[in-house]
């Protein structure tokens, strides 16, 4: 079995986690993809997922999580905005491929969110130009409930901060001021 590894990434409250999960284009371009959190002794919990089939470059927002799947690049971009200390925990991207088990995209991210936002006076995490405008009807995709029980045995030690994850939609103000697609060449 492939050894599961993780990388620690530390941010402050109010900042944005912005990661890119690679996948094999030929196999998984239109597959449904998800962002999960792994709690101690529990199955990975899906926080957000793309549509099924996954739409190219179509932002999906679930609360403070935004997913964008770039089929041409084999890349799922995940953003968690306005981070809170309670968001600390172990995260992973997976690809749903029923009836088979979800395929995990390496590596897992050990997110550590600390108190105290480091912005300069007058700066705004949400201020940007030439943003990608998310339509008012941004999709909230339905995510499959199943998760591989096999991954439970591989759950890592509990992180220092307990993780609370919203099951319901969280209102995110000015989301159109946060998201901008990469300028792919």
């Amino acid at each position: 079995a492939t050894k599961l590894t993780e990388e620690k990434y530390e941010l402050k409250e109010g900042q944005t986690l912005d990661v890119k999960c690679d996948y094999t284009l030929e196999k998984f371009a239109s597959s449904q993809k998800a962002w999960q959190i792994i709690r101690d002794g529990e199955m990975p919990k899906t926080l957000a997922c793309t549509e099924r089939p996954s739409k190219n470059s179509h932002p999906v927002q679930v609360g403070r999580i935004i997913l964008e799947d770039y089929h041409d690049h084999g890349l799922l971009r995940v953003r968690m905005v306005n981070l809170q200390v309670e968001d600390s925990g172990l995260y992973q991207c997976v690809i749903y491929q029923p009836p088979k088990e979800p395929h995990m995209l390496f590596d897992r991210i050990r997110l550590v969110v600390t108190k105290g936002f480091s912005g300069t006076p007058g700066s705004n995490e949400n201020s940007t130009q030439n943003v990608y405008k998310i339509p008012p009807t941004t999709t909230k995709a339905l995510c499959p409930l199943y998760t591989s029980p096999r991954t439970v045995t591989q759950a890592p030690p509990k992180s220092t901060a307990d993780v609370s994850t919203p099951d319901s939609e969280i209102n995110l103000t000015n989301v159109t001021d946060i998201i901008r697609v990469p300028v792919f060449n």
């Epitope: 912005d18 201020s127 940007t128």
Partner: antibody, heavy 119, light 108 residues
Framework: EVQLLESGGGMVQPGGSLRLSCAVS????????MSWVRQAPGKGLEWVSE????????YYADSVKGRFTISRDNSKNTLYLQMNSLRVEDTAIYYC????????????WGQGTLVTVSS | EIVMTQSPATLSVSPGERATLSCRAS??????LAWYQQKPGQAPRLLIY???TRATGIPARFSGSGSGTEFTLTISSLQSEDFAVYYC??????????FGQGTKVEIK
């Protein structure tokens, strides 16, 4: 211990070609995006190219697009940069760098290899 | 492409003094900013990522702050080994990753 070791640099005439290699160890090479970053003598850092891990997608700076090709051999834990139609302005130290935490920033760098393009 | 501008180009500081380096982005990069240190004849070394998080093994005298378009790297008390060139890099709007032109911190 993570190590990146570049090779293949040297002197070449304008219009010529070179192939740089970067042998890596200490991490699971196939999982990580890798980049080439260059530095002209006495100048700053310039990102040149990136190749993603699982997808194999490639990206290039406008200054090298169509002339340089990035590739990797996961079985050999090696990253490559094929440089064709070299110009005087391509003269630089070329570093290979490992991506950190699924983001396009770099936590490990090689020592660099010097490419000199001169007639 | 996002343009990163660093100032000053050269900073002359005495050992033990505080050094403040600035980096400005042409448009918002949120907190997706890193700082690197490069000494003569060496490869760059990651100091700060996420605008304010010290990379593994980086001393506490290095601190980063800012978000959006304005960022600062502060070295609280310069040691002899800190005299080097410092680069900021944005990794928000990718590709390309863009670096600032660098700030050289020299002994006064």
């Amino acid at each position: 211990e993570v190590q990146l070791l570049e090779s293949g640099g040297g002197m070449v005439q304008p219009g010529g070609s070179l192939r740089l290699s970067c042998a890596v160890s200490g991490f699971t090479f196939s999982r990580y995006a890798m980049s080439w970053v260059r530095q002209a003598p006495g100048k700053g850092l310039e990102w040149v190219s990136e190749m993603r891990g699982s997808s194999g997608s490639t990206y290039y700076a406008d200054s090298v697009k169509g002339r340089f090709t990035i590739s990797r051999d996961n079985s050999k834990n090696t990253l490559y940069l094929q440089m064709n139609s070299l110009r005087v302005e391509d003269t630089a130290i070329y570093y290979c760098a490992k991506e950190f935490s699924s983001n396009s920033l770099f936590d490990y760098w090689g020592q660099g290899t010097l490419v000199t393009v001169s007639s | 492409e996002i343009v990163m501008t660093q100032s000053p180009a050269t900073l002359s500081v005495s050992p033990g003094e505080r050094a403040t380096l600035s980096c400005r982005a042409s448009q918002s990069v949120n907190s997706n900013l890193a700082w690197y240190q490069q000494k003569p004849g060496q490869a760059p070394r990651l100091l700060i990522y996420g605008a304010s998080t010290r990379a593994t093994g980086i001393p506490a005298r290095f601190s980063g702050s800012g978000s959006g378009t304005e960022f600062t790297l502060t070295i609280s008390s310069l040691q002899s080994e800190d005299f080097a060139v410092y680069y900021c890099q944005q990794f928000y709007n990718w590709p390309p990753n863009t670096f600032g032109q660098g700030t050289k911190v020299e002994i006064k």
